[in-house]
Protein backbone atom coordinates (compact mmCIF):
# COMPACT_ATOMS: atom_id res chain seq x y z
CA UNK A 1 0.00 0.00 0.00
CA UNK A 2 1.19 3.48 -0.88
CA UNK A 3 0.52 6.14 1.72
CA UNK A 4 -1.92 8.93 0.95
CA UNK A 5 -1.20 12.22 2.70
CA UNK A 6 -4.13 14.35 3.84
CA UNK A 7 -3.28 17.86 4.98
CA UNK A 8 -5.59 19.88 7.18
CA UNK A 9 -5.38 23.18 9.01
CA UNK A 10 -5.25 23.30 12.79
CA UNK A 11 -8.64 24.07 14.30
CA UNK A 12 -10.56 23.14 11.17
CA UNK A 13 -12.14 19.89 10.01
CA UNK A 14 -10.36 17.36 7.83
CA UNK A 15 -12.20 14.81 5.74
CA UNK A 16 -10.39 11.62 4.79
CA UNK A 17 -11.87 9.40 2.09
CA UNK A 18 -11.01 5.76 1.51
CA UNK A 19 -12.37 4.29 -1.73
CA UNK A 20 -12.85 0.53 -1.96
CA UNK A 21 -14.43 -2.19 -4.11
CA UNK A 22 -18.01 -2.31 -2.85
CA UNK A 23 -18.56 -5.85 -4.12
CA UNK A 24 -15.37 -7.29 -2.64
CA UNK A 25 -16.13 -5.73 0.75
CA UNK A 26 -19.89 -6.38 0.68
CA UNK A 27 -21.27 -7.01 4.16
CA UNK A 28 -18.11 -5.94 5.94
CA UNK A 29 -17.91 -3.31 8.65
CA UNK A 30 -15.12 -0.75 8.40
CA UNK A 31 -12.78 0.86 10.90
CA UNK A 32 -10.33 3.74 11.28
CA UNK A 33 -7.24 3.02 13.33
CA UNK A 34 -4.18 4.95 14.38
CA UNK A 35 -0.79 3.40 13.70
CA UNK A 36 1.92 3.88 16.31
CA UNK A 37 4.89 4.57 14.02
CA UNK A 38 5.45 3.45 10.45
CA UNK A 39 5.73 -0.20 11.50
CA UNK A 40 3.75 -0.09 14.71
CA UNK A 41 0.44 -1.67 15.71
CA UNK A 42 -2.83 -0.02 14.69
CA UNK A 43 -5.11 1.11 17.51
CA UNK A 44 -8.83 1.27 16.70
CA UNK A 45 -10.24 4.79 16.88
CA UNK A 46 -13.75 4.31 15.56
CA UNK A 47 -15.71 1.74 13.54
CA UNK A 48 -18.92 1.80 11.51
CA UNK A 49 -22.31 0.74 12.85
CA UNK A 50 -22.58 -2.80 14.25
CA UNK A 51 -25.33 -3.48 11.71
CA UNK A 52 -23.76 -3.29 8.26
CA UNK A 53 -27.01 -2.08 6.69
CA UNK A 54 -26.82 0.97 8.95
CA UNK A 55 -23.20 1.79 8.01
CA UNK A 56 -24.36 5.06 6.48
CA UNK A 57 -25.16 6.33 9.99
CA UNK A 58 -22.39 8.50 11.37
CA UNK A 59 -20.57 7.05 14.37
CA UNK A 60 -18.35 9.21 16.51
CA UNK A 61 -15.52 8.77 18.99
CA UNK A 62 -14.55 12.12 20.44
CA UNK A 63 -13.67 14.44 17.56
CA UNK A 64 -13.48 11.61 14.99
CA UNK A 65 -16.53 10.49 13.00
CA UNK A 66 -16.95 7.70 10.44
CA UNK A 67 -19.59 6.95 7.82
CA UNK A 68 -19.67 4.37 5.03
CA UNK A 69 -21.27 4.59 1.61
CA UNK A 70 -21.48 0.84 1.05
CA UNK A 71 -23.01 1.13 -2.43
CA UNK A 72 -20.60 3.73 -3.75
CA UNK A 73 -17.65 2.12 -1.96
CA UNK A 74 -16.34 5.11 -0.04
CA UNK A 75 -15.47 5.22 3.64
CA UNK A 76 -15.35 8.77 5.00
CA UNK A 77 -13.66 9.84 8.21
CA UNK A 78 -14.00 13.36 9.58
CA UNK A 79 -11.56 14.77 12.12
CA UNK A 80 -13.12 17.84 13.75
CA UNK A 81 -11.14 20.68 15.33
CA UNK A 82 -7.87 19.28 14.01
CA UNK A 83 -5.02 19.51 16.53
CA UNK A 84 -1.26 18.89 16.23
CA UNK A 85 -1.59 15.64 18.18
CA UNK A 86 -3.99 14.31 15.52
CA UNK A 87 -1.08 14.13 13.07
CA UNK A 88 0.22 10.70 12.24
CA UNK A 89 -0.30 7.41 10.48
CA UNK A 90 -3.76 5.88 10.18
CA UNK A 91 -5.42 3.06 8.29
CA UNK A 92 -8.86 2.55 6.81
CA UNK A 93 -9.73 -1.07 7.42
CA UNK A 94 -12.32 -3.58 6.26
CA UNK A 95 -13.24 -6.03 9.02
CA UNK A 96 -14.02 -9.71 8.66
CA UNK A 97 -14.08 -11.82 11.79
CA UNK A 98 -11.00 -10.97 13.83
CA UNK A 99 -9.09 -10.02 10.67
CA UNK A 100 -8.74 -6.60 9.10
CA UNK A 101 -7.80 -5.75 5.50
CA UNK A 102 -6.13 -2.41 4.88
CA UNK A 103 -8.12 -0.30 2.44
CA UNK A 104 -5.79 2.70 2.56
CA UNK A 105 -2.80 3.90 4.53
CA UNK A 106 -3.10 7.54 5.47
CA UNK A 107 -0.72 10.14 6.83
CA UNK A 108 -2.53 13.07 8.42
CA UNK A 109 -0.53 16.29 8.51
CA UNK A 110 -1.67 19.28 10.53
CA UNK A 111 -0.71 22.65 9.08
CA UNK A 112 -0.45 25.78 11.17
CA UNK A 113 -3.31 28.17 10.40
CA UNK A 114 -1.82 30.77 8.01
CA UNK A 115 -4.25 33.35 9.42
CA UNK A 116 -3.36 32.69 13.05
CA UNK A 117 -0.88 35.50 13.65
CA UNK A 118 -0.30 34.45 17.25
CA UNK A 119 1.97 31.76 15.85
CA UNK A 120 3.33 33.48 12.77
CA UNK A 121 6.81 32.08 13.35
CA UNK A 122 5.45 28.57 13.08
CA UNK A 123 3.92 28.92 9.61
CA UNK A 124 4.84 25.63 8.01
CA UNK A 125 5.74 24.95 4.46
CA UNK A 126 6.68 21.26 4.74
CA UNK A 127 10.10 20.19 3.58
CA UNK A 128 11.04 16.99 1.86
CA UNK A 129 10.12 13.95 3.91
CA UNK A 130 12.18 11.02 2.73
CA UNK A 131 9.74 8.63 4.39
CA UNK A 132 7.27 8.86 1.55
CA UNK A 133 8.81 8.98 -1.88
CA UNK A 134 5.65 7.42 -3.35
CA UNK A 135 3.11 9.16 -1.16
CA UNK A 136 0.09 10.70 -2.84
CA UNK A 137 -1.03 14.02 -1.37
CA UNK A 138 -4.70 14.92 -1.05
CA UNK A 139 -5.05 18.59 -0.13
CA UNK A 140 -7.92 18.98 2.27
CA UNK A 141 -7.31 22.55 3.33
CA UNK A 142 -10.85 23.80 3.71
CA UNK A 143 -10.49 27.37 2.53
CA UNK A 144 -9.17 29.14 -0.53
CA UNK A 145 -5.62 30.39 -0.50
CA UNK A 146 -5.26 34.12 -0.14
CA UNK A 147 -3.92 36.14 -3.07
CA UNK A 148 -0.16 35.80 -3.21
CA UNK A 149 -0.16 33.04 -0.62
CA UNK A 150 2.06 30.08 -1.40
CA UNK A 151 0.20 26.75 -1.28
CA UNK A 152 1.67 24.09 0.95
CA UNK A 153 3.73 21.73 -1.18
CA UNK A 154 3.44 17.99 -0.65
CA UNK A 155 5.98 16.26 1.57
CA UNK A 156 6.83 14.08 -1.43
Amino acid sequence: HNTTVFQGVEGQSLQVSCPYDSMKHWGRRKAWCRQLGEKGPCQRVVSTHNLWLLSFLRRRNGSTAITDDTLGGTLTITLRNLQPHDAGFYQCQSLHGSEADTLRKVLVEVLADPLDHRDAGDLWVPGESESFEDAHVEHSISRSLLEGEIPFPPTS
Epitope: Q35, L36, G37, E38, K39, G40, H85, G88, F89, S131
Partner: antibody
Framework: EVQLQQSGAELVRSGASVKLSCTAS????????IHWVKQRPEQGLEWIGW????????KYAPKFQGKATMTADTSSNTAYLHLSSLTSEDTAVYYC?????????????WGQGTSVTVSS | DIQMNQSPSSLSASLGDTVTITCHAS??????LSWYQQKPGDHPKLLIY???NLHTGVPSRFSGSGSGTGFTLTISSLQPEDIATYYC?????????FGGGTKLEIK
Amino acid sequence: EVQLQQSGAELVRSGASVKLSCTASGFSIEDFYIHWVKQRPEQGLEWIGWIDPENGDSKYAPKFQGKATMTADTSSNTAYLHLSSLTSEDTAVYYCHADHGNYGSTMDYWGQGTSVTVSS
Amino acid sequence: DIQMNQSPSSLSASLGDTVTITCHASQHINVWLSWYQQKPGDHPKLLIYKASNLHTGVPSRFSGSGSGTGFTLTISSLQPEDIATYYCQQGQTYPRTFGGGTKLEIK
Protein backbone atom coordinates in the same frame (compact mmCIF):
# COMPACT_ATOMS: atom_id res chain seq x y z
CA GLU B 1 13.57 -10.39 27.93
CA VAL B 2 13.65 -7.88 25.09
CA GLN B 3 17.14 -6.59 24.40
CA LEU B 4 19.73 -5.56 21.82
CA GLN B 5 23.19 -7.03 22.39
CA GLN B 6 26.08 -5.28 20.67
CA SER B 7 29.51 -6.65 19.86
CA GLY B 8 32.55 -5.82 21.97
CA ALA B 9 34.90 -2.85 21.89
CA GLU B 10 37.16 -2.42 18.87
CA LEU B 11 40.64 -0.95 18.60
CA VAL B 12 41.48 -0.40 14.93
CA ARG B 13 44.16 1.27 12.86
CA SER B 14 43.57 4.45 10.92
CA GLY B 15 42.49 3.65 7.35
CA ALA B 16 41.10 0.25 8.27
CA SER B 17 37.45 -0.73 8.50
CA VAL B 18 35.29 -2.34 11.17
CA LYS B 19 31.98 -4.19 11.30
CA LEU B 20 29.80 -3.87 14.40
CA SER B 21 26.92 -6.19 15.20
CA CYS B 22 23.63 -5.79 17.06
CA THR B 23 21.65 -8.93 17.91
CA ALA B 24 18.05 -8.75 19.03
CA SER B 25 16.43 -11.13 21.48
CA GLY B 26 12.79 -11.21 22.54
CA PHE B 27 11.58 -9.68 19.27
CA SER B 28 12.07 -9.97 15.54
CA ILE B 29 14.11 -7.21 13.90
CA GLU B 30 11.85 -7.51 10.83
CA ASP B 31 9.09 -5.81 12.82
CA PHE B 32 11.27 -2.77 13.55
CA TYR B 33 13.59 -0.23 12.02
CA ILE B 34 17.15 -0.51 13.27
CA HIS B 35 18.89 2.82 13.71
CA TRP B 36 22.54 3.49 14.39
CA VAL B 37 23.64 6.46 16.50
CA LYS B 38 27.16 7.80 17.02
CA GLN B 39 28.44 9.49 20.17
CA ARG B 40 31.96 10.89 20.26
CA PRO B 41 33.68 11.21 23.65
CA GLU B 42 32.03 13.94 25.75
CA GLN B 43 29.84 14.89 22.78
CA GLY B 44 26.21 14.65 21.75
CA LEU B 45 24.27 12.11 19.72
CA GLU B 46 24.39 11.86 15.91
CA TRP B 47 21.93 9.81 13.88
CA ILE B 48 23.75 7.70 11.26
CA GLY B 49 20.75 6.10 9.58
CA TRP B 50 18.25 3.27 9.66
CA ILE B 51 17.71 -0.03 7.96
CA ASP B 52 14.44 -1.88 7.49
CA PRO B 53 15.49 -5.53 7.96
CA GLU B 54 12.24 -6.71 6.36
CA ASN B 55 13.31 -5.54 2.91
CA GLY B 56 16.85 -4.15 3.27
CA ASP B 57 15.77 -0.55 2.62
CA SER B 58 18.03 1.98 4.30
CA LYS B 59 18.38 5.71 4.83
CA TYR B 60 21.60 7.49 5.75
CA ALA B 61 22.31 10.93 7.12
CA PRO B 62 24.24 12.75 4.35
CA LYS B 63 27.28 13.06 6.62
CA PHE B 64 27.61 9.27 6.87
CA GLN B 65 27.00 8.31 3.27
CA GLY B 66 30.11 6.55 2.00
CA LYS B 67 31.40 6.11 5.55
CA ALA B 68 28.75 3.78 6.98
CA THR B 69 27.00 0.76 5.49
CA MET B 70 24.09 -0.86 7.31
CA THR B 71 23.00 -4.43 6.67
CA ALA B 72 20.76 -6.93 8.42
CA ASP B 73 20.44 -10.70 8.57
CA THR B 74 16.95 -11.75 9.62
CA SER B 75 17.92 -15.40 10.03
CA SER B 76 20.26 -14.48 12.90
CA ASN B 77 18.11 -11.49 13.99
CA THR B 78 21.21 -9.31 13.70
CA ALA B 79 21.92 -5.87 12.25
CA TYR B 80 25.40 -4.73 11.22
CA LEU B 81 27.17 -1.42 10.82
CA HIS B 82 30.26 -1.36 8.61
CA LEU B 83 32.54 1.67 8.94
CA SER B 84 35.26 2.22 6.34
CA SER B 85 38.41 4.35 5.94
CA LEU B 86 38.54 5.02 9.64
CA THR B 87 40.06 8.19 11.05
CA SER B 88 40.32 9.65 14.55
CA GLU B 89 36.96 11.37 13.88
CA ASP B 90 35.35 7.92 13.93
CA THR B 91 36.48 7.24 17.51
CA ALA B 92 33.15 7.00 19.30
CA VAL B 93 30.55 4.80 20.92
CA TYR B 94 28.08 3.42 18.38
CA TYR B 95 24.58 2.49 19.51
CA CYS B 96 21.99 0.42 17.73
CA HIS B 97 18.40 1.36 18.41
CA ALA B 98 15.11 -0.29 17.39
CA ASP B 99 11.76 1.45 16.98
CA HIS B 100 8.69 1.46 14.76
CA GLY B 101 9.84 4.44 12.73
CA ASN B 102 8.67 8.03 12.59
CA TYR B 103 5.23 9.29 13.48
CA GLY B 104 4.61 8.13 17.00
CA SER B 105 6.47 4.90 17.69
CA THR B 106 5.91 3.81 21.29
CA MET B 107 8.62 1.15 21.12
CA ASP B 108 12.21 2.07 21.87
CA TYR B 109 15.03 -0.40 22.47
CA TRP B 110 18.76 0.39 22.63
CA GLY B 111 21.93 -1.65 22.64
CA GLN B 112 24.57 -1.03 25.29
CA GLY B 113 26.87 0.57 22.71
CA THR B 114 30.14 -0.49 21.09
CA SER B 115 33.25 1.59 21.66
CA VAL B 116 35.43 2.06 18.57
CA THR B 117 38.89 3.54 19.04
CA VAL B 118 40.91 4.47 15.97
CA SER B 119 44.65 4.56 16.54
CA SER B 120 47.20 6.10 14.22
CA ASP C 1 18.40 18.96 7.53
CA ILE C 2 16.27 20.20 10.41
CA GLN C 3 18.42 21.84 13.09
CA MET C 4 17.48 21.33 16.73
CA ASN C 5 18.59 24.09 19.07
CA GLN C 6 18.51 22.99 22.69
CA SER C 7 18.95 25.30 25.67
CA PRO C 8 20.49 25.68 28.09
CA SER C 9 23.55 23.53 27.36
CA SER C 10 24.06 23.05 31.09
CA LEU C 11 21.92 23.65 34.11
CA SER C 12 22.45 23.56 37.85
CA ALA C 13 19.42 23.08 40.09
CA SER C 14 18.56 22.05 43.64
CA LEU C 15 16.72 18.90 44.64
CA GLY C 16 12.98 19.56 44.64
CA ASP C 17 13.27 22.31 42.02
CA THR C 18 11.26 22.44 38.81
CA VAL C 19 13.56 22.36 35.78
CA THR C 20 12.70 23.42 32.24
CA ILE C 21 14.67 22.54 29.10
CA THR C 22 13.69 23.93 25.70
CA CYS C 23 14.22 22.75 22.17
CA HIS C 24 13.65 24.82 19.04
CA ALA C 25 13.35 23.27 15.57
CA SER C 26 14.49 25.14 12.47
CA GLN C 27 11.36 23.91 10.65
CA HIS C 28 7.85 22.99 11.69
CA ILE C 29 7.92 19.42 13.01
CA ASN C 30 4.34 19.21 14.23
CA VAL C 31 4.52 17.05 17.38
CA TRP C 32 7.24 14.70 16.14
CA LEU C 33 9.68 15.28 18.97
CA SER C 34 11.17 12.87 21.50
CA TRP C 35 13.12 13.56 24.68
CA TYR C 36 15.90 11.23 25.84
CA GLN C 37 17.79 10.97 29.12
CA GLN C 38 21.37 9.70 29.13
CA LYS C 39 23.42 8.95 32.23
CA PRO C 40 27.23 8.60 32.03
CA GLY C 41 28.29 5.25 30.57
CA ASP C 42 24.73 4.30 29.66
CA HIS C 43 22.64 4.37 26.49
CA PRO C 44 19.95 7.03 25.96
CA LYS C 45 16.53 6.24 27.40
CA LEU C 46 13.27 7.49 25.92
CA LEU C 47 11.31 9.75 28.27
CA ILE C 48 8.75 11.47 26.06
CA TYR C 49 7.51 10.68 22.55
CA LYS C 50 5.24 12.70 20.29
CA ALA C 51 6.09 15.87 22.24
CA SER C 52 3.96 15.15 25.30
CA ASN C 53 3.45 11.39 25.71
CA LEU C 54 5.19 9.78 28.66
CA HIS C 55 7.03 6.58 27.74
CA THR C 56 6.22 3.43 29.72
CA GLY C 57 7.80 3.39 33.17
CA VAL C 58 8.89 7.04 33.15
CA PRO C 59 7.99 8.91 36.38
CA SER C 60 5.14 11.41 36.09
CA ARG C 61 7.38 14.27 37.25
CA PHE C 62 8.62 14.36 33.65
CA SER C 63 6.37 16.14 31.17
CA GLY C 64 6.67 17.46 27.64
CA SER C 65 4.81 20.13 25.74
CA GLY C 66 4.88 22.08 22.51
CA SER C 67 4.21 21.72 18.80
CA GLY C 68 5.44 23.30 15.60
CA THR C 69 8.90 24.61 16.37
CA GLY C 70 8.97 25.14 20.14
CA PHE C 71 9.14 22.33 22.71
CA THR C 72 9.70 22.04 26.44
CA LEU C 73 10.75 19.26 28.80
CA THR C 74 9.80 19.92 32.42
CA ILE C 75 11.04 18.00 35.44
CA SER C 76 9.05 18.86 38.54
CA SER C 77 10.51 18.14 41.99
CA LEU C 78 14.02 17.25 40.83
CA GLN C 79 15.36 13.96 42.23
CA PRO C 80 19.00 12.79 42.57
CA GLU C 81 18.46 10.13 39.90
CA ASP C 82 17.49 12.82 37.37
CA ILE C 83 21.09 13.99 37.10
CA ALA C 84 21.90 13.24 33.46
CA THR C 85 22.16 14.79 30.00
CA TYR C 86 18.89 15.35 28.16
CA TYR C 87 18.49 15.36 24.38
CA CYS C 88 15.62 16.25 22.10
CA GLN C 89 15.26 14.50 18.74
CA GLN C 90 12.99 15.34 15.82
CA GLY C 91 11.19 12.55 13.98
CA GLN C 92 9.42 14.58 11.30
CA THR C 93 11.87 13.88 8.49
CA TYR C 94 15.04 11.96 7.81
CA PRO C 95 17.77 12.47 8.71
CA ARG C 96 16.62 12.47 12.28
CA THR C 97 18.48 15.13 14.22
CA PHE C 98 19.27 15.61 17.90
CA GLY C 99 19.62 18.74 19.96
CA GLY C 100 23.05 19.45 21.42
CA GLY C 101 22.06 18.19 24.86
CA THR C 102 21.48 19.74 28.29
CA LYS C 103 23.69 18.59 31.13
CA LEU C 104 21.76 18.75 34.40
CA GLU C 105 23.71 18.99 37.65
CA ILE C 106 22.85 19.37 41.31
CA LYS C 107 23.53 22.75 42.90
